[in-house]
Amino acid sequence: EEYIVEVGQNAYLPCFYTLDTPGNLVPVCWGKGACPVFECGDVVLRTDERDVSYRTSSRYWLNGDFHKGNVTLAIGNVTLEDSGIYCCRVQIPGIMNDKKFNLKLVIKPAKVTPAPTLPRDSTPAFPRMLTTEDHGPAETQTLEILHDKNLTQLSTLANELQDAGTTIRIHHHHHH
C-alpha cells in the first residue's frame, strides 16, 4: 500500500487487527523499514497489552481506537525524511504468529496553488477545506482538496481520517 502526503501535513498509516475477546490487546510495534524477522527495525512506536509503551517522539501517535484493534500510526507535520517503508507488526501470541504489514509513505513537496476564482453567488461543488480535531499533538489538522489534474496522484478513491472512532470519508471526483 502506498500513501501520498504533502510536506507539513499529518500522515496516517492504517493498521488493524481483530481482538480475540474485547480488551484482549496484543503488543504492536511500528518501525521505519520493511518488517524484519522479528520486532520492528528502527522502532518509532510500541504498544504493550495496555497502552502505548514507547515512542521516539511526540510526532508519532496512534490515531484510531487502539482498544478496538485500530493501531493506525499518525506522523505529525511530515518532512521529506519521513518518506519510506513503515512496518506495522502485530505480535499475536504464539509461535511465528505475527501479522506483518509494510506500508509505503511518499512525501511530496508542498504544492502552492492559487485559489480558483469563483463567480459571485456561486458555491464550490464540495467544501474546499475540511478541519477535524485530532488526538495527537494539540493542533488542528487541515486537509485541502485540490481541483487540478494532479488529483490523479491520489491513488485511492476515498482517504480516511480517523478521529477517536469517527470516520470521515472525503470522496475525490476526478474531472478531466
Epitope: 503488543p27 510495534c29 518501525g31 524484519p36 522479528f38 520492528c40 527495525g41 505480535q91 504464539g94 504468529n97
Partner: antibody
C-alpha cells in the same frame, strides 16, 4: 556495561533434556528481543530461536521447532531455552544474544551442550 | 532458507584492503537492507561489526564498511591490521535469520 551470562550446559544423552539460562545486565532487558544462536564444534553460526519484547511471540529455526522452547522472565532479567528430545547434532556452544530486530549486538560467552551416549 | 555463500578464506598484507562477499537471493540479501556482519576470534563469542547492510555500531573502527549490490553483500576491511585476523560471518534477517558459512581472514607477514 552489557553482560550476558549463560549457564545450564553440560553432557546429556540423546533423547534427554536440558534447560539453559541467560542472565542479562547492563541494559533494559524488557525493551529488547532476545535470541539463542549456536555453533557446533569447528562449524559456523546457526540461529536457534528468538523471543519478542513481551515474550508472547516466539520464533524458531526449523531444526529445533517442536523440541525447543524459548521463554523469558523480564522481572528477573533472564532468558531461557528448554531443550527436549536432544540429538547428537544439537551438540554445540549455545550463545545468548541481544537480538534487536534480527542482528545481535551483544553476545554471551556461550555454554557448551554435548549430546552423547 | 539455505545458508548464504561466503568464500572460505581471504588474505592480505597489513595496510591492504580485503573484501568478503556474501551471496544470497532476492528473498533475503537482495530484497531487504537487513544484512549484518560478525567477527569471531578463536574461542571467543562473535562481535557485531555491521548491521542493516552498512551501519557500524559504536566502537567498531571505521576501517570496516559494508555495502550491497543486487543479491551480494560485502564487508571491506581497509588498512588491514594483525588483530583483524579472525572468522567473519554474514547474516540476513528478513524472513528468517540465516548465516553465511564464514570466511577466515588471514593477515600475511
Amino acid at each position: 556495561e552489557v553482560q550476558l551470562v549463560e549457564s545450564g550446559g553440560g553432557l546429556v544423552q540423546p533423547g534427554g533434556s536440558l534447560r539453559l539460562s541467560c542472565a542479562a545486565s547492563g541494559f533494559t532487558f524488557s525493551s529488547y528481543a532476545m535470541s539463542w544462536v549456536r555453533q557446533a564444534p569447528g562449524k559456523g553460526l546457526e540461529w536457534v530461536s528468538a523471543i519478542s519484547v513481551s515474550g508472547g511471540s516466539t520464533y524458531y529455526a526449523d531444526s529445533v521447532k517442536g523440541r525447543f522452547t524459548i521463554s523469558r522472565d523480564n522481572s528477573k532479567n533472564t532468558l531461557y531455552l528448554q531443550m527436549n528430545s536432544l540429538r547428537a547434532e544439537d551438540t554445540a556452544v549455545y550463545y545468548c544474544a541481544k537480538a534487536n530486530w534480527g542482528f545481535f549486538d551483544y553476545w554471551g560467552q556461550g555454554t557448551l551442550v554435548t549430546v552423547s551416549s | 532458507q539455505s545458508a548464504l555463500t561466503q568464500p572460505r578464506s581471504v588474505s592480505g598484507s597489513p595496510g591492504q584492503s580485503v573484501t568478503i562477499s556474501c551471496t544470497g537471493t532476492s528473498s533475503d540479501v537482495g530484497g531487504y537492507n537487513y544484512v549484518s556482519w560478525y567477527q569471531q576470534h578463536p574461542g571467543k563469542a562473535p562481535k557485531l561489526m555491521i548491521y542493516d547492510v552498512s551501519k557500524r555500531p559504536s566502537g567498531v573502527p571505521d576501517r570496516f564498511s559494508g555495502s550491497k549490490s543486487g543479491n551480494t553483500a560485502s564487508l571491506t576491511i581497509s588498512g588491514l591490521q594483525a588483530e583483524d585476523e579472525a572468522d567473519y560471518y554474514c547474516s540476513s534477517y528478513a524472513d528468517s535469520v540465516v548465516f553465511g558459512g564464514g570466511t577466515k581472514v588471514t593477515v600475511l607477514g
